[in-house]
Interface confidence: low
C-alpha cells in the first residue's frame, strides 16, 4: 500500500481468483483514543471500533472511502483504490491501446518545435468517474523538471457503437536547451483513476523523435507567363523554432488531381518555393519536416490550382 | 571570419558534408520507431558517446560568441563515431551488405573531421569505449543503437554548419 495523495491510498493486488488479498491497517487521524467507529462509503454499518481498523482487501467491494467517527462527528477519511496485477502484469483497462507506432501504446506525444513544449494524449471509452494526473521529468535517476498542466477532455468521437474520449495534456521542460543533442529521454507518467481502480501509464521519448511541425503557412501560387507552370511559395510555420538558418525544414510539394487514382507529382526542396505544373482541377499541397532529423512530416497545407 | 582561438572552418563545405552525413545516417538505419532501443538496456553501451550538450556553445548565440568550443566538440564526436564505425562492431559478423551506406558514412565522418582539423592542428579526442559484443545479435543491436545515436549527433552538427554557412561565413 502506498499514498497517492493526502488521504488516498493505492493497494496493489495480485488479482487471482480468490487471492487472499492484502491486509491493510487504517489509522484514524485524531488524538482521540476511544469511542471511535469505522464505516465504508455511504453505509452506516459499523465495520469496527478503535483507533485502528484492520481489513483484508481482496476486491473492489473492499475498496472505497473509509471514515472514522466519534459520536456522530467525522474524524478523518482514507480512500482506498485498487491497482490490479493479473498474470504478473499491471492492468491497463482504463485507456485504449492506440497501437501506433506499436502495440501497447497508450500515450502518444508530439512537439511542434524544439522549445521543450510537448502535448500528450490518450483515449478511453469511459465517460464518468474518471480522473487523471500527469507528471513528467527529463531522465529518471536524477530527474530534471518538466511542468505539466491538467489533463483535459480534448475530443469526443463515435467509433461504431462506442463513444471514444480523447484527453490531452501540455507539458514544458523547465530549462529546455533547444540546440543541444538530447541524451536523456523525457519520461511521462499518467495516473488514471476510474471509480476505485488505479492504473498508471508511462511513455519515454526524446523530443527530437516526437517532432511534428505545423503545416507551412501562406501557401501561394504565382502563374508564370506563357506557361502551365506556377511558382508555389510558402513560409515556415510560426510555431517552428528559430532562427530558421539553424532550425531548418525541408519540404515536399505535391500536385494531386481530383481523383485519388491520378498520379501524384512530388518535389522535395529545402527552399520555400518551387515551380510545378498546375493541372486543371488539381490542388497543390506542401508539408514540412525537420531537414536534418527524420521525425514526422507535418500535415499538408493545400491550395487549388484554379 | 576568424574566430578567437582558431581559424574559421570552411562553413559551406562543412554544411554540405554534414547534410550528406544526415542522409547517410538515416539510410543506414531507417527503422525509426520499429525497435525501441531504449527498452533494450543500452545504458552501458551508448551513454559513453560524446553528446553535444547545453554548455558546448553549439546554439546560435554560442556560435556567434566563439564557435571553437562547439567545433571542438563536434570534431570529438566525429572521430569517436568514425572509430566505432570502423570497429569490430560494424566489420564483424553478421557482415554488412556490399551496398550498405555504412562504408560511405564512415568515409564521410572522416572527411568532415579532416575539414574541421587540418594537418598539424590537434584537438583532444575522446577515448572510444571497448565494446566487444560476443554474439552476432548483440552486435546487430549495438549497430542500431550507435546509428540512432549518430543520427541525433549529426543533426545537431548539420544545424551548426548550416547556421554558420548562413551567418558566419567570411
Amino acid at each position: 500500500i502506498w499514498e497517492l495523495k493526502k488521504d488516498v491510498y493505492v493497494v496493489e493486488l495480485d488479482w487471482y481468483p480468490d487471492a487472499p488479498g492484502e491486509m491493510v491497517v487504517l489509522t484514524c487521524d485524531t488524538p482521540e483514543e476511544d469511542g471511535i467507529t469505522w464505516t465504508l462509503d455511504q453505509s452506516s454499518e459499523v465495520l469496527g471500533s478503535g483507533k485502528t481498523l484492520t481489513i483484508q482487501v481482496k476486491e473492489f467491494g473492499d475498496a472505497g472511502q473509509y471514515t472514522c467517527h466519534k459520536g456522530g462527528e467525522v474524524l478523518s477519511h482514507s480512500l482506498l483504490l485498487l491497482h490490479k496485477k493479473e498474470d504478473g502484469i499491471w492492468s491497463t483497462d482504463i485507456l485504449k491501446d492506440q497501437k501506433e507506432p506499436k502495440n501497447k501504446t497508450f500515450l502518444r506525444c508530439e512537439a511542434k518545435n524544439y522549445s521543450g513544449r510537448f502535448t500528450c494524449w490518450w483515449l478511453t471509452t469511459i465517460s464518468t468517474d474518471l480522473t487523471f494526473s500527469v507528471k513528467s521529468s527529463r531522465g529518471s535517476s536524477d530527474p530534471q523538471g518538466v511542468t505539466c498542466g491538467a489533463a483535459t477532455l480534448s475530443a469526443e468521437r463515435v467509433r461504431g457503437d462506442n463513444k471514444e474520449y480523447e484527453y490531452s495534456v501540455e507539458c514544458q521542460e523547465d530549462s529546455a536547451c533547444p540546440a543541444a543533442e538530447e541524451s536523456l529521454p523525457i519520461e511521462v507518467m499518467v495516473d488514471a483513476v476510474h471509480k476505485l481502480k488505479y492504473e498508471n501509464y508511462t511513455s519515454s521519448f526524446f523530443i527530437r523523435d516526437i517532432i511534428k511541425p505545423d503545416p507551412p503557412k501562406n501557401l501561394q501560387l504565382k502563374p508564370l507567363k506563357n506557361s502551365r507552370q506556377v511558382e508555389v511559395s510558402w513560409e515556415y510555420p510560426d510555431t517552428w523554432s528559430t532562427p530558421h538558418s539553424y532550425f531548418s525544414l525541408t519540404f515536399c510539394v505535391q500536385v494531386q488531381g481530383k481523383s485519388k487514382r491520378e498520379k501524384k507529382d512530388r518535389v522535395f526542396t529545402d527552399k520555400t518555393s518551387a515551380t510545378v505544373i498546375c493541372r486543371k482541377n488539381a490542388s497543390i499541397s506542401v508539408r514540412a519536416q525537420d531537414r536534418y532529423y527524420s521525425s514526422s512530416w507535418s500535415e499538408w497545407a493545400s491550395v487549388p490550382c484554379s | 571570419r576568424a574566430v578567437p582561438g582558431g581559424s574559421s572552418p570552411a562553413w559551406t563545405q562543412c554544411q554540405q558534408l554534414s547534410q550528406k552525413l544526415c542522409t547517410l545516417a538515416w539510410s543506414a538505419h531507417p527503422l525509426v520507431g520499429h525497435m525501441d532501443l531504449r527498452e533494450e538496456g543500452d545504458e552501458e553501451t551508448t551513454n559513453d558517446v560524446p553528446h553535444i550538450q547545453c554548455g558546448d556553445g553549439c546554439d546560435p548565440q554560442g556560435l556567434r560568441d566563439n564557435s571553437q568550443f562547439c567545433l571542438q566538440r563536434i570534431h570529438q564526436g566525429l572521430i569517436f563515431y568514425e572509430k566505432l564505425l570502423g570497429s569490430d562492431i560494424f566489420t564483424g559478423e553478421p557482415s554488412l551488405l556490399p551496398d550498405s551506406p555504412v562504408g560511405q558514412l564512415h568515409a564521410s565522418l572522416l572527411g568532415l573531421s579532416q575539414l574541421l582539423q587540418p594537418e598539424g592542428h590537434h584537438w583532444e579526442t575522446q577515448q572510444i569505449p571497448s565494446l566487444s559484443p560476443s554474439q552476432p545479435w548483440q552486435r546487430l543491436l549495438l549497430r542500431f543503437k550507435i546509428l540512432r545515436s549518430l543520427q541525433a549527433f549529426v543533426a545537431v552538427a548539420a544545424r551548426v554548419f548550416a547556421h554558420g554557412a548562413a551567418t558566419l561565413s567570411p
Epitope: 495480485d14 487471482y16 481468483p17 480468490d18 487471492a19 487472499p20 476486491e59 473492489f60 467491494g61 498474470d87 504478473g88 483497462d93 481502480k197 | -
Partner: antibody, heavy 114, light 112 residues
Framework: EFQLVQSGAEVKKPGASVKVSCKAS????????MNWVRQAPGQRLEWMGV????????TYNQKFKGRVTITVDTSASTAYMELSSLRSEDTAVYYC???????WGQGTLVTVSS | DIVMTQTPLSLPVTPGEPASISCRSS???????????LNWFLQKPGQSPQLLIY???TRASGVPDRFSGSGSGTDLTLKISRVEAEDVGVYYC?????????FGSGTKLEIK
Amino acid sequence: EFQLVQSGAEVKKPGASVKVSCKASGYTFTDHNMNWVRQAPGQRLEWMGVINPNYGTTTYNQKFKGRVTITVDTSASTAYMELSSLRSEDTAVYYCARRGFAYWGQGTLVTVSS
Amino acid sequence: DIVMTQTPLSLPVTPGEPASISCRSSKSLLYKDGKTYLNWFLQKPGQSPQLLIYLMQTRASGVPDRFSGSGSGTDLTLKISRVEAEDVGVYYCQQIAEYPFTFGSGTKLEIK
C-alpha cells in the same frame, strides 16, 4: 444473497450456435469477473473463458479457437456465453461461475443432436 | 496448458474414517507471492460444483473443518479427517495459476 441464475436447457443441431445467459444478483455485477465452465457427460470440468464485466475484456481457452464469445449486459447484470459451429461433443452442462469460483450458476444443459 | 492428474479415480470410505485425495500438477502452482493457486471442489450428484478449499489450504466459508488442504507447488492433497455420509460426490482439483484454468479428472468418493 449472491445468486447466479442461468437460462434453460437447449437442443441444437450440429453447425448451429447456442447462447446461454447467466443473471447475477446480490452483488455489484461489474466488481467480479465471470467465468464459464462446461462439463460433458462423465467428463472432467473444462474452463472456457472469463470476462471482466466492467471493461468487457475477455480471455478464452484456446481449445475453443474462436468458437466461443463471452459478453455482458451490465444494465441487466447478465453474462452471456455463445458457442458456434456446434458438434455432438459440445453436448454438456454449461456453468457460469463468479470470480473465485465460490458461486456457480445451476447449469444449462445443451444437447447437440441431428 | 497445465495438466492436473488426480488419484485415485474412485475412493470407497467407511463413515468416520479419514480419506485423502491427491492431485499432481505438471507445473508448479506456487507463485512468486508465496501463494499456491489451487482450488478443491466437491460436486454432489445433480448439483453444481461447490468450492471447498482455495489457495491450496484456505477453507471457503461454511466448509467444515474436517476438510483440509496441503502440499507443495506440484503435489497437492485434500484430506477429510472423518468422512460423513453427506461428503459423497466427485472431488475436483483446479489450478488457477495461469490461463487456461484446468481441472483434475475427478475422484469419486463413495460410502462403503
